[in-house]
Interface confidence: medium
């Protein structure tokens, strides 16, 4: 039985092989039980965590992970050298920067060591699974009487990232948001000097170097303007 699983995040279909063994009864052997799906994320291209739901196993099982790169001159199978654990059971593998080849097809194989025929293989495009760190060092400067410019930094190659800026005043029910390209700056042309503004930014590895769907965490917010919270009926609801 060969099952194709659609994986999220724009990756190739993952082909998982489940092996049927001869069975004297109607019950399925353990080798037919599907293995949990492996989810990998590359954090700021500093390290990668590939994790699975270990609690989905019918009994506690230390599943093993192997990986290799398709179409590499040296596509030798590598063993996970740094397992992550959940309640003393393997639930993931961490790969360091030197082991991450963003632009090669990453092949990851999960296996039940007690039932070696029970294994699942997925192919992932790592450039679509990068999550950068949150933007840092947000600064605001006044370009004119009514215009503000927001700048920030990323601990990553700036040309690889796009950004989403959100801002609101203490009087706003919701955030206003604006997409920003790799230039990592944003101008707000019309600022009301009587209001207090809050800005925050998040970043994504898209579109020049990859097609990641996941955003970074939000930056710490930065504020501008007078604090009008005493007269503002919405402020405390917004902070919740």
């Amino acid at each position: 039985l060969n099952t194709t699983i659609l994986t999220p995040n724009g990756n190739e279909d993952a082909t998982t092989d489940f092996f049927l063994t001869s069975m004297p009864t109607d019950s399925l052997s353990v080798s037919t039980l599907p293995l949990p799906e492996v989810q990998c994320f590359v954090f700021n291209v500093e390290y990668m965590n590939c994790t699975w739901n270990s609690s989905s196993e019918p009994q506690p099982t230390n599943l093993t992970l192997h990986y290799w790169y398709k179409n590499s001159d040296n596509d030798k199978v590598q063993k996970c050298s740094h397992y992550l654990f959940s309640e003393e059971i393997t639930s993931g593998c961490q790969l360091q920067k030197k082991e991450i080849h963003l632009y090669q097809t990453f092949v990851v194989q999960l296996q039940d060591p007690r039932e070696p025929r029970r294994q699942a293989t997925q192919m992932l495009k790592l450039q679509n699974l990068v999550i950068p760190w949150a933007p840092e060092n947000l600064t605001l400067r006044k370009l004119s009487e009514s215009q503000l410019e927001l700048n920030w930094n990323n601990r990553f190659l700036n040309h690889c990232l796009e950004h989403l800026v959100q801002y609101r005043t203490d009087w706003d029910h919701s955030w206003t948001e604006q997409s920003v390209d790799y230039r990592h700056k944003f101008s707000l042309p019309s600022v009301d000097g009587q209001k207090r503004y809050t800005f925050r930014v998040r970043s994504r590895f898209n579109p020049l170097c990859g097609s990641a769907q996941h955003w970074s965490e939000w930056s710490h917010p930065i504020h501008w303007g007078s604090n009008s919270s005493k007269e503002n009926p919405f402020l405390f609801a917004l902070e919740a």
Epitope: V45, S72, D73, K97, K98, I100, L102, Q104, L157
Partner: nanobody, 118 residues
Framework: QVQLVESGGGLVQAGGSLTLSCAAP????????VGWFRQAPGKEREFVAS????????YYDDSVKGRFTISRNNAWNTVNLQMNSLKVEDTAVYYC???????????WGQGTQVTVSS
Amino acid sequence: QVQLVESGGGLVQAGGSLTLSCAAPGRTFGTDVVGWFRQAPGKEREFVASISRSGDGIYYDDSVKGRFTISRNNAWNTVNLQMNSLKVEDTAVYYCAAGDGWSTYDYWGQGTQVTVSS
């Protein structure tokens, strides 16, 4: 700052060949990896091939494997992309990039246009 310069692009008929060259004029690349990427109109930039400084690591995208060959000179200041059996779908702007690891490319060239006609 490493300045990368691509050359060798042009118009070629399907089935033909071209050799693209990436140079870091007057110096070595100063990085461990050089790669070629391409971007067709309306599409995202995609990986084509890469090679390590030592030459022991070479990678190709599925779409070009067996048709394209990446190579370097010993001085590590030129990397060539030999493109054979070109297809119309190979039409794109080809970019050279250099970086300190397989994961990240810090330096990019301006690109060279390759057009494959039927």
